[in-house]
Interface confidence: low
């Protein structure tokens, strides 16, 4: 008799793929544009990335450090009108893109939560949640919660409002903290909260350390749903050298949880390569004319246009990973098992019941390595086959689809492999 199928877990929309943050509308659109109407015109691009949600803003009225002149119910006219926002919501819905609104109050000021009048601000947030839920947003983000006194209790209250409206609504909290204990204390009192933090930002570039951080986090959080990013707002290039971007894309898309990216992560947007651009929100490079300040500073392969047509680009890799992440059961909600593969390497299996299984092998090192996959670390339910098919490599030149003998696996410096193999009873 065939074995019984394992019951599928309840899947919320944010479990099914990546979130894409656009914190600065003007930088994202460039050319002095930067409003909600213009963003609507970029939704097809977001669709092509196969992201599930857009984390937008903040876009509310905020006079720097002035509580009285901060109105979370009003859109800053520089960004457009409530009608523009409604139109964006409708268009996004048609394209199956959810919209999450950032309500971090004092986003133009020194302290995101103002240094005093915490209760006044908290009340404003509460009113804003109810207002924007009625307007049709799919969730909210609040950042810098380490600056919010009694953050846990406020988050619990806001979570209740959000979930009370619909279980299908999401609350994201962001913190600059990378301390696991602080992160866990925020999570403990808030069951469905999605938390972005700097936890992985100091993973350095060793496979062992990254493996240790990931496994510690997963063990500590138990069965709760995680999110994966390197910070609450900043670009991957703020933390990583260019040669590790592909590796991290592969890792973030294949760990169990929701990957969260900032605009530009998909092309390796790097403020350091654009003189005069702010580190936290450089202009998005749609094409070579996006940064006219210094002629020749931008080459085609740094842009969306240039990378869109190149199957070997970071953007093409992002699209492929995003596609796999959103359609494979083992990547959507499969079990995770990390195991030893040798110094400098981080490897793990994702598997769900009798569905196709995935093996990820990541070489964080500067030298080519042979992988010694220690299958003895794995439970019987997740055993390794002798061969697996190469689904993709972060490096060009691999024959995709070819079967690789796992005993003879060799990885180039900074190479990541995603391999697939069938369930075997």
């Amino acid at each position: 008799r065939a074995p019984r199928c394992r019951e599928l877990p309840a899947q919320k929309w944010w479990h099914t793929g990546a979130l894409y943050r656009i914190g600065d509308l003007q930088a994202f659109q460039g050319h002095g544009a930067g409003n909600l109407a213009g963003l609507k015109g970029r939704l097809d691009y977001l669709s092509s990335l196969k992201v599930k949600g857009l984390v937008l803003g903040p876009i509310h009225k905020n006079q720097k450090d002035d509580v009285a002149q901060t109105d979370l119910l009003q859109i800053d006219p520089n960004f457009g009108s409530k009608e523009d926002f409604d139109s964006l919501l409708q268009s996004a819905k048609k394209k199956s893109i959810r919209v999450i609104l950032d309500l971090t109050p004092n986003y133009r000021g020194e302290n995101s939560w103002f240094s005093t009048q915490v209760d006044t601000v908290a009340t404003k947030v509460k009113d804003a949640l109810e207002f924007w839920l009625q307007a049709g947003v799919d969730g909210f983000q609040v950042r810098d919660i380490e600056n919010l006194k009694d953050a846990s209790s406020f988050l619990a209250e806001w979570q209740n409002i959000t979930k009370g409206f619909s279980e299908d609504r999401l609350l994201i909290a962001g913190t600059n903290s990378s301390d696991l204990q602080q992160i866990l204390s925020l999570l403990e009192s808030n069951k469905d909260l999605l938390l972005t933090s700097s936890y992985l930002s100091d993973s350095g570039s060793t496979g062992e350390h990254t493996k240790s951080l990931v496994t510690q986090y997963l063990n500590a959080t138990g069965n709760r749903w995680c999110s994966w990013s390197l910070s609450q707002a900043r670009l991957l290039t703020s933390f990583l050298p260019a040669q590790l971007l592909r590796l991290y894309q592969l890792m973030l898309f294949t760990l169990p949880g929701t990957p969260v990216f900032s605009y530009g992560d998909e092309i390796g947007l790097d403020a350091a390569a654009l003189p005069g651009q702010p580190m936290e929100a450089p202009v998005m490079l749609w094409d070579e004319s996006s940064f006219p300040d210094i002629p020749g500073a931008v080459s085609a392969n740094m842009t969306v246009k240039g990378q869109s047509e190149d199957p070997g680009s970071l953007l093409s890799l992002f699209r492929r990973l995003s596609d796999q992440r959103s359609k494979e059961r083992s990547l959507l909600h499969g079990d995770f098992h990390a195991f030893s593969a040798g110094p400098g390497l981080f490897s793990y299996i994702r598997h769900w019941d009798q569905n196709e299984r995935f093996l990820v092998v990541l070489n964080f090192g500067d030298v080519g390595l042979s992988a010694g996959l220690q299958a003895s670390d794995l439970p019987a339910s997740a055993s390794l086959p002798a061969k697996a098919d190469l689904l993709l490599s972060t490096q060009p030149g691999r024959e995709e689809g070819s079967p690789l003998e796992l005993e003879r696996l060799k990885l180039e410096p900074h190479e990541g492999l995603l391999l697939r193999f069938p369930y075997a009873a």
Partner: antibody, heavy 122, light 113 residues
Framework: QVQLKESGPGLVQPSQTLSLTCAVS????????VIWVRQPPGKGLEWMAV???????NYNSTLKSRLSISRDTSKSQVYLKMNSLQTEDTATYYC????????????????WGQGVMVTVSS | DIVMTQTPSSQAVSAGEKVTMSCKSS????????????LAWYQQKPGQSPKLLIY???TRESGVPDRFMGSGSGTDFTLTISSVQAEDLAVYYC?????????FGAGTKLELK
Amino acid sequence: QVQLKESGPGLVQPSQTLSLTCAVSGFSLSNYGVIWVRQPPGKGLEWMAVIWTNGNTNYNSTLKSRLSISRDTSKSQVYLKMNSLQTEDTATYYCARHYYDGTYYYGYFDYWGQGVMVTVSS
Amino acid sequence: DIVMTQTPSSQAVSAGEKVTMSCKSSQSLLYTENKKNYLAWYQQKPGQSPKLLIYWASTRESGVPDRFMGSGSGTDFTLTISSVQAEDLAVYYCQQYYYFPYMFGAGTKLELK
């Protein structure tokens, strides 16, 4: 208006190298990718290679070891070299332009050259 | 690589007749988030180069007569010519552009009865 025109030898000896040129006008190679496709007599279309606007290339895996695609943007020309020709490489060779909608490239081809017939025979 | 299978390989028709031809792909060409099918149809008349007819499975290229209609989704697609004209006698190819490398079908040849 947009035009692509292939040129090359009509006859090539077996084991020799084929060199083809695709001259384009009405658009820039800095903005569009160009592909080569071939069609043996009475048979279907086979995608061979592409050169993208950044100069990156991709090849049909079955022909990869024998192919080389390149371009000269200033001359608006794309070149295809294919070595170790055999009689089964007898075909009409076309170049075509990748579709581009201003933001994103899609893998269908809106303009084609008229083709050049290449016979491999001794 | 994706395999594109076209049927029939040839079809004899009379002018004014309605014609349908099929194209099946070995993997789905539908991306559910934008609800688009990454499939194109080309027409190749004798002695000529292929000409783009339809993209996104059902969008006619400008200048293509409205008697040509593309339909289908996922793995099964159809090209219909509502009333065949003499100038429509040609080979019709489907092509997927969802996955790299882009693959063509073997073609359906339209001939006069």
